[in-house]
Every structure is written in structure tokens, then in C-alpha cells.
Interface confidence: low
């Protein structure tokens, strides 16, 4: 019967934020500047991610966690951990897997992101179309034709454009 031995790895005592320095008798040394170790027992520290160009720093690198990036205004993140920045679409477009595409006829998008939505069907409410829809704007419904007296005008201007995720005041 051969007894198995349990060997304690001296590096396992090194906490996050340090590395097991083989050049110094496996002493736990702090990660150098601009590097990190997110788990204990590591023999090297990883280099911090740098957020440059269209990337913007969301969270700074620390000795125990990598930097996190997001995108400058006008762009949005794609991929795990914001590995890419993709340009926002324009009003009248929607984002597809092949990039920004114009809204199909009969749909609109008044935001710089999101999906194209169908124009309102005025006739469902017994109303008529006062202002035709566009790729960027919904139709404007008005009274039914029978309700319009000669000379009467009740055209409503289209709603103002909205920025992504917001309707400005």
C-alpha cells in the first residue's frame, strides 16, 4: 500500500494582485504597474487592457482586475467584453448583422439605434392619414374624412427626433 503525498504548492498562498516570483524563491510579489492578477496562485501577472482610439475607459485597471472599455459617443460595443466598437445607425435605419440598413417601406425608426417599427395604421382607429410616414417618422393620423369640414385644418407636426434611449426636453 503506497501512501499518496499531498504536496502544498507554495504559490497557492499568493493572493490576487500578486504573482509567485520564481526568481525570488517563490515569494509573492505585487503585480507591477499596468498589470493584474485576478486569481490567487498565479505565476505571472497579465498586462492591463488599454482603451485607445474609439475605445474609452469604463473601469480603470487595478492590481486585481483588468481595465474595461466601452465606446465613445456615436459608437456602441460589440462582442464579449466590448471587443469592438461599431458606429451607431442613423434615424431611418436599423442595425442588422450586416450593418446599418434603411428601414423597409412602411416602417420607421426615429432613433439612432433600435429597430424599424411599422407605421401606425390610422384606419384601425377610424382615422385618416394627415401626414405620410417616412423612414424616420411615423404617419400622423387625423380625423376620419367624414369629420373634416371644408377649410378645416388640423395637421399635427411630426414628433421631434429622439437621441438613443432618450427623448430630449
Amino acid at each position: 500500500f503506497e501512501r499518496t503525498r499531498s504536496l502544498q504548492d507554495p504559490c497557492s498562498n499568493c493572493p490576487a494582485g500578486t504573482f509567485c516570483d520564481n526568481n525570488r524563491n517563490q515569494i509573492c510579489s505585487p503585480c507591477p504597474p499596468n498589470s493584474f492578477s485576478s486569481a490567487g496562485g498565479q505565476r505571472t501577472c497579465d498586462i492591463c487592457r488599454q482603451c485607445k482610439g474609439v475605445f474609452r475607459t469604463r473601469k480603470e485597471c487595478s492590481s486585481t482586475s483588468n481595465a474595461e472599455c466601452d465606446c465613445t459617443p456615436g459608437f456602441h460595443c460589440l462582442g464579449a467584453g466590448c471587443s469592438m466598437c461599431e458606429q451607431d445607425c442613423k434615424q431611418g435605419q436599423e442595425l442588422t448583422k450586416k450593418g446599418c440598413k434603411d428601414c423597409c417601406f412602411g416602417t420607421f425608426n426615429d432613433q439612432k439605434r433600435g429597430i424599424c417599427r411599422p407605421w401606425t395604421n390610422c384606419s384601425l382607429d377610424g382615422k385618416s392619414v394627415l401626414v405620410n410616414g417616412t423612414k424616420e417618422r411615423d404617419v400622423v393620423c387625423g380625423p376620419s374624412p367624414a369629420d373634416l369640414s371644408p377649410g378645416a385644418s388640423s395637421v399635427t407636426p411630426p414628433a421631434p427626433a429622439r437621441e438613443p434611449g432618450h427623448s430630449p426636453q
Epitope: R56, P73, H76, C77, I115, R162
Partner: antibody, heavy 121, light 107 residues
Framework: EVQLVESGGGLVQPGGSLRLSCAAS?????????WDWIRQAPGKGLEWVSS????????YYADSVKGRFTISRDNSKNTLYLQLNSLRAEDTAVYYC?????????????WGQGTLVTVSS | DIQLTQSPSSLSASVGDRVTITCRAS??????LAWYQQKPGKAPKLLIY???SLESGVPSRFSGSGSGTDFTLTISSLQPEDFATYYC?????????FGQGTKVEIK
């Protein structure tokens, strides 16, 4: 690490005013994110109140506070403000400031601990 | 305004259970949805953004799915620290709106 600390809450009579502050550290509020106020009435859910863009040029308000509340910021102090005027009993809530993280959209990734506003006579 | 309806409003579960919370939007919001956890007396904490992206530092037992109008938050194996109230939030358009919350209690 981004930290947000609210202050300025307290007891105020209906019709009164308060100014809430949100001091940010670890990140410049002028760096292009949106900064928000969200409130939570006692025992109730969360309600978005207002947002201000990173450049301070654009502000947004919930209909329930429009014309009564004003959001602003002071870049030199790295502080966000919410001026509360014409307060009503239904404005009683814990007010949180938060940062909107712009990934594919805007989610609220950092929150302060909140400050309680009580409107009562 | 876009309404978000969470279900159930409360649930009782045991440690180790798989828990699912749903959030339904009154209109399509693509993937512009986040999930938050809130404990009594504390600020909400972001768990999931863009419907399925796990926030940094959040345990992998939390996951989100869905697009359009129907979304789900799943906790694969409930832990003692997970007993809290969970909120969904849409950021497709203003006003930014939240679901009414789902309270997860100990059975």
C-alpha cells in the same frame, strides 16, 4: 473605482424646495456618459427621474417631475445636482444618482447609496 | 411609455433551486434591457445589460436571455446571498422604465 455619494435629502413641507447633490469620485462626470437620478418611494419600485448628458447640453425628465425638477452638474466639483421645487407628498422617496454605461445601450452600472427626501406637513 | 411587466411578483425558493423571472415589454425593445438586484436598504446592483451580457464581477449563475418583448433572468443555482428583489429596466426610449420587481424569498 467609481463612487457616487448623494446628500441633501431631508424633511420638507409640501410646496418646498431641496437641492440634492451627488459627488462622483474615480471618474469625471464630463467624460461623456449620461448621469441619472432614480427614485424609490418607501416600499415601492424604482422610478427614473432625470438624466443629463456627459457634455451637459441635453437633459431629460420624467413627466411626473417636468417643470418642477432641474438636473445640472458642476464639472469643477465633479458633482451632479437635482433641484427639487414645488414638492409634493408623492415625491417622498429615496433618491439615487447613477451612471449610465453605454455598451450597446444605456444601463445603470454605478449607483450611489441614496438620500431620503420626505415631503410632509 | 413602455411598460414592463415582471412575473412572478414574488416567489419562494430554496438554496440550490433554479429560479426564472420573466419580464415582458409592452412593445419591442430589441435587446435594450437590464436586470438589477436590490437588497433592503441598499442601492440596486447591475447584473445583466443588453439582455444577456453579464456585468463584470457578477457570478456566472446569473444569466439573461430574450429579445423584442420577452426576457428572462435565470439563476441557475440559488445561493443564500441571492435572496433579494430583482428589477428589469428598458433603455430603448425615454422615459426609462422599470418592472415592478420580483421578490425572491427563502422557502
Amino acid at each position: 473605482e467609481v463612487q457616487l455619494v448623494e446628500s441633501g435629502g431631508g424633511l420638507v413641507q409640501p410646496g418646498g424646495s431641496l437641492r440634492l447633490s451627488c459627488a462622483a469620485s474615480g471618474y469625471s462626470i464630463s467624460s461623456g456618459y449620461y448621469w441619472d437620478w432614480i427614485r424609490q418611494a418607501p416600499g415601492k419600485g424604482l422610478e427614473w427621474v432625470s438624466s443629463i448628458s456627459g457634455d451637459g447640453d441635453t437633459t431629460y425628465y420624467a413627466d411626473s417631475v417636468k417643470g418642477r425638477f432641474t438636473i445640472s452638474r458642476d464639472n469643477s466639483k465633479n458633482t451632479l445636482y437635482l433641484q427639487l421645487n414645488s414638492l409634493r407628498a408623492e415625491d417622498t422617496a429615496v433618491y439615487y444618482c447613477a451612471r449610465e454605461y453605454y455598451g450597446y445601450g444605456y444601463a445603470l452600472d454605478y449607483w450611489g447609496q441614496g438620500t431620503l427626501v420626505t415631503v410632509s406637513s | 411609455d413602455i411598460q414592463l411587466t415582471q412575473s412572478p411578483s414574488s416567489l419562494s425558493a430554496s438554496v440550490g433551486d433554479r429560479v426564472t423571472i420573466t419580464c415582458r415589454a409592452s412593445q419591442g425593445i430589441s435587446s435594450y434591457l437590464a436586470w438589477y438586484q436590490q437588497k433592503p436598504g441598499k442601492a440596486p446592483k447591475l447584473l445583466i445589460y443588453d439582455a444577456s451580457s453579464l456585468e463584470s464581477g457578477v457570478p456566472s449563475r446569473f444569466s439573461g436571455s430574450g429579445s423584442g418583448t420577452d426576457f428572462t433572468l435565470t439563476i441557475s443555482s440559488l445561493q443564500p446571498e441571492d435572496f433579494a428583489t430583482y428589477y428589469c429596466q428598458q433603455y430603448y426610449s425615454t422615459p426609462l422604465t422599470f418592472g415592478q420587481g420580483t421578490k425572491v424569498e427563502i422557502k
